[in-house]
């Protein structure tokens, strides 16, 4: 969380962003909230982004200006119109782009003032894993896949039952490139499977960690898929 | 840690050219818009020119307008200025800057270019 | 183009005294100027962006205020390195950018 004050001859209002991650190819949020003003005309919210000449977005009295919006941007961003009244200038970015990635502003001035806070937005692409057994293989064999993962992860298996195990000699793992040319397939395979045991698949990058889970018994398998985005700050 | 290093400066006679160049590292080149920025002997900054990061949009000042050529090369991590018809009034230190929030959050040491007969 | 008019142009201060230079856009420019200190030799240095955003590393005794046609950078207990000139610069929409003509801080 990143909490920013504004310092001028005007009075300082507070802003506050907060740290995350964009799915290149869906559509993402930056989040900024202020101390809300009585009358949307006199607020403005401008976004940037470090290092970009234009401007990523600009809302004012009531509604978008996007003349000085970067072409990087066009057609891209979007505030939360009905929220901005409330103190949310939460940006939508559509599509996101690997280039997306860096350090953007989010800059307020209302009637009680103006303020500031960063923000840090990471891109890649990152998804749930499925793990299911591998009837075709000879031996008890799980087969974890992801379909999408940006930049690549490591892989790790895990046992409830032989917890601190470790399974690199008994694991097999692939990153296949798919067509955009960006984002990779996961696939790991895990050889010599007890039954009567939960396993994990664990993926992460630095944007995100994600877990397949399985349970082989006799007479059933249970599964269970956990996403987490990492580094979610904010400031 | 960012670095920029310019190089190409050097004495030069009217109506002569040069080719500046400003190699950068230590951030991704290719996120940030670059920016030329002289000085005149005893004198003040004056802008000269920046570039997107793509390249794609060029702006100038009037005063080297349709003389000279701000260009970058991402994959080599390098600004360029390209300076024709080169006058008197050119004569200052160049320095290369990387835009952050519209200003100029790191700059190279310079070179200096100085324009006489 | 839009013009930056600096005041004064010299001003002569003890280690201690509150410094303040002012920068008057010749147009509306929003929160959109930033304050450079040079050193003889030296290239420009960041200290404040967005009219009052304080560079990372910059020291806390550099402010910046002013909104519009009107800047003010405030050196609270000036320094010995902070001996210097002091340049404004404006960065509304896109370039041509422009600087103001400069502040030199000298010791009296």
């Known amino acids: 969380l990143i909490i920013g004050f504004g310092i001028s001859g005007r009075h300082s209002i507070t802003v506050t962003t907060v740290a995350s991650a964009g799915n290149i190819g869906e559509d993402g949020i930056l989040s900024c909230t202020f101390e809300p003003d009585i009358k949307l005309s006199d607020i403005v919210i401008q976004w940037l982004k470090e290092g970009v000449l234009g401007l990523v977005h600009e809302f004012k009295e009531g509604k978008d200006e996007l003349s000085e919006q970067d072409e990087m941007f066009r057609g891209r961003t979007a505030v939360f119109a009905d929220q901005v009244i409330v103190g949310n200038a939460s940006l939508r970015l559509k599509n996101v782009q690997l280039t997306d990635a860096g350090t953007y502003k989010c800059y307020i001035i209302t009637s009680k003032g103006k303020g500031n806070a960063n923000l840090e937005y990471k891109t890649g692409a990152f998804s749930m894993p499925e793990v299911n057994v591998d009837y075709n293989a000879s031996s008890e064999t799980l087969r974890c896949e992801a379909p999408r993962w940006f930049p690549q992860p490591t892989v790790v298996w895990a046992s409830q039952v032989d917890q601190g195990a470790n399974f690199s000699e008994v694991s097999n793992t692939s990153f296949e490139l798919n067509s955009e040319n960006v984002t990779m397939k996961v696939v790991s395979v895990l050889y010599n499977v007890t039954i009567n045991n939960t396993y994990s698949c664990m993926i992460e990058n630095d944007i995100a960690k994600a877990t397949g889970d399985i349970k082989v018994t006799e007479s059933e398998i249970k599964r269970r898929s956990h996403l987490q985005l990492l580094n979610s700050k904010a400031s | 840690e960012v670095q920029l290093l310019e190089s190409g400066g050097g004495l030069v006679q009217p109506g002569g050219s040069l080719r500046l160049s400003c190699a950068a590292s230590?951030?991704?080149?290719?996120?940030?818009?670059m920016s030329w920025v002289r000085q005149a002997p005893g004198k003040g900054l004056e802008w000269v020119s920046a570039i997107s990061g793509s390249g794609g949009s060029t702006y100038y000042a009037d005063s080297v307008k349709g003389r000279f050529t701000i260009s970058r090369d991402n994959s080599k991590n390098t600004l360029y200025l390209q300076m024709n018809s080169l006058r008197a009034e050119d004569t200052a230190v160049y320095y290369c800057?990387?835009?952050?929030?519209?200003?100029?959050?790191?700059w190279g040491q310079g070179t200096t270019v100085t324009v006489s007969s | 183009d839009i013009q930056l008019t600096q005041s004064p142009s010299s001003v002569s201060a003890s280690v201690g005294d509150r410094v303040t230079i002012t920068c008057r856009a010749s147009?509306?420019?929003?929160?959109?100027l930033a304050w450079y200190q040079q050193k003889p030799g030296k290239a420009p240095k960041l200290l404040i962006y967005?009219?009052?955003s304080l560079q990372s590393g910059v020291p806390s005794r550099f402010s910046g205020s002013g909104s519009g046609t009107d800047f003010t950078l405030t050196i609270s207990s000036l320094q010995p390195e902070d001996f210097a000139t002091y340049y404004c610069q404006q960065a509304t929409s896109y370039p041509p950018w422009t600087f103001g003509g400069g502040t030199k801080v000298e010791i009296k």
């Open positions: 147009q509306d420019i929003s929160s959109w």
């Open positions: 800057a990387r835009v952050g929030f519209r200003a100029l959050n790191y």
């Open positions: 230590g951030f991704t080149f290719s996120s940030y818009a």
């Open positions: 967005a009219a009052s």
